[in-house]
Every structure is written in C-alpha cells, then in structure tokens.
C-alpha cells in the first residue's frame, strides 16, 4: 500500500478546558480528518507546546481570528 494510506494523522482525544491567553499562542491548525474521532484545533504556543482545543468554543474562534490577522501580510 502507498505510504499515504497508512500515514498517521494528528488527532485529539479531548480538549483543554482552560482558555489560553492569545499572547501565549504562536500558530494553529485545524484537524478535520475523518480518521480522527472529532474535529479540533491544535494551538502551538510560543514555547512550542501543542494543545487541543474545541473549535466550537468562542475563545478558540477568537484566537484563530487573532492569529490570522497577525499572519496577514500588511498592504503596502
């Protein structure tokens, strides 16, 4: 079988129940693979720790929006 079929995917068992300060966050990625038990957002903190969060929670959505704005290239 091709490697891609058996390649593991990163998933989340559960979500943090603590809101993370946006100042501690460096980036995020969405987890939408059908191989995972649930959809999730994985935040990477400024110290490179990865934390699973619930994409349905408002603070998670707000944090993603904030990170998106941070990474947008300023218009010249």
């Amino acid at each position: 079988q091709p490697d891609a079929i058996n390649a593991p995917v990163t998933c989340c068992y559960n979500f943090t129940n603590r809101k993370i300060s946006v100042q501690r966050l460096a980036s995020y990625r969405r987890i939408t693979s059908s191989k995972c038990p649930k959809e999730a957002v994985i935040f990477k903190t400024i110290v490179a720790k990865e934390i699973c969060a619930d994409p349905k929670q408002k603070w998670v959505q707000d944090s993603m929006d904030h990170l998106d704005k941070q990474t947008q290239t300023p218009k010249t």
Epitope: T10, Y13, F15, I51, C52
Partner: nanobody, 126 residues
Framework: EVQLVESGGGLVQAGGSLRLSCAAS????????IAWFRQAPGKEREVVSC????????YYADSVKGRFTISSDNAKNTVFLQMNSLKPEDTAVYYC???????????????????WGQGTQVTVSS
C-alpha cells in the same frame, strides 16, 4: 494489509455484561497502543479505554471506571474490553484503533492516529 476487526457486540439488558475483542493484523502490535472509542447516535466519538501494548499501562474514561476492564493478549495481537454493569447510556458503536499513545493526565495533548476498525454495535436495553 492492516486490519483491526472488532467482535463481541450485541444486545444486552441493563446490568449485563459483554466482552469485546479487537483482533489486529498487518502491523507490529508492540509498537502501538490500542484504544477503544464509542459513538452514540448524534454524538461525537469518545475514547473509552486504552492499553499500551509495550508496557501494559491503561486508561479509562471516568464514565466507565470500575465497570470496564481492558486487557491484551500480545501473542494473539488481540485486545479485549470486558464491559460489566452495562447501562443504557453505554449504547453505541464501539471501535478500536491503533494509536501512538493512550490519553495521559493532560489528555488535551495531540496524539497520532493510525487505523480504525469497522466497529461493533452494543445496545443496552432498560
């Protein structure tokens, strides 16, 4: 070919017992943990129990602690989930999966998910 095959599901009355089996083939059993998940209609999959094949360490969700017991027969590449004192809320499709590690205290840390089985239906009637 990698395969995870669940069996042992069925219909049981509340208070009864079932023993689920997850037979694995096509990969080196000792390199993975095996987790049992369940999914009830209209709900997300949740992890129920997990066992690390390498050291035998186990995990149980709070909702099944004291009622479910996970074990493995490494020689037969099979993991068992003994389910006692079943409740109607245990009704779900139960799936086993090969994963990188079982949940820890910090179970909001990501893990690697390799393969799912097809699932076995467990129905607990009141």
């Amino acid at each position: 070919e990698v395969q995870l095959v669940e069996s042992g599901g069925g219909l049981v009355q509340a208070g009864g017992s079932l023993r689920l089996s997850c037979a694995a083939s096509g990969f080196t059993f000792d390199d993975y943990a095996i987790a049992w998940f369940r999914q009830a209609p209209g709900k997300e999959r949740e992890v129920v129990s997990c066992i690390s094949s390498s050291d035998g360490s186990t995990y149980y969700a709070d909702s099944v602690k004291g009622r479910f017991t996970i074990s493995s027969d490494n020689a037969k590449n099979t993991v068992f989930l003994q389910m006692n004192s079943l409740k109607p809320e245990d009704t779900a499709v139960y799936y086993c999966a090969a994963v990188s590690n079982c949940p820890r205290d910090s179970d909001y840390i990501p893990y690697l998910h390799y393969w799912w089985g097809q699932g076995t239906q467990v129905t607990v009637s009141s």
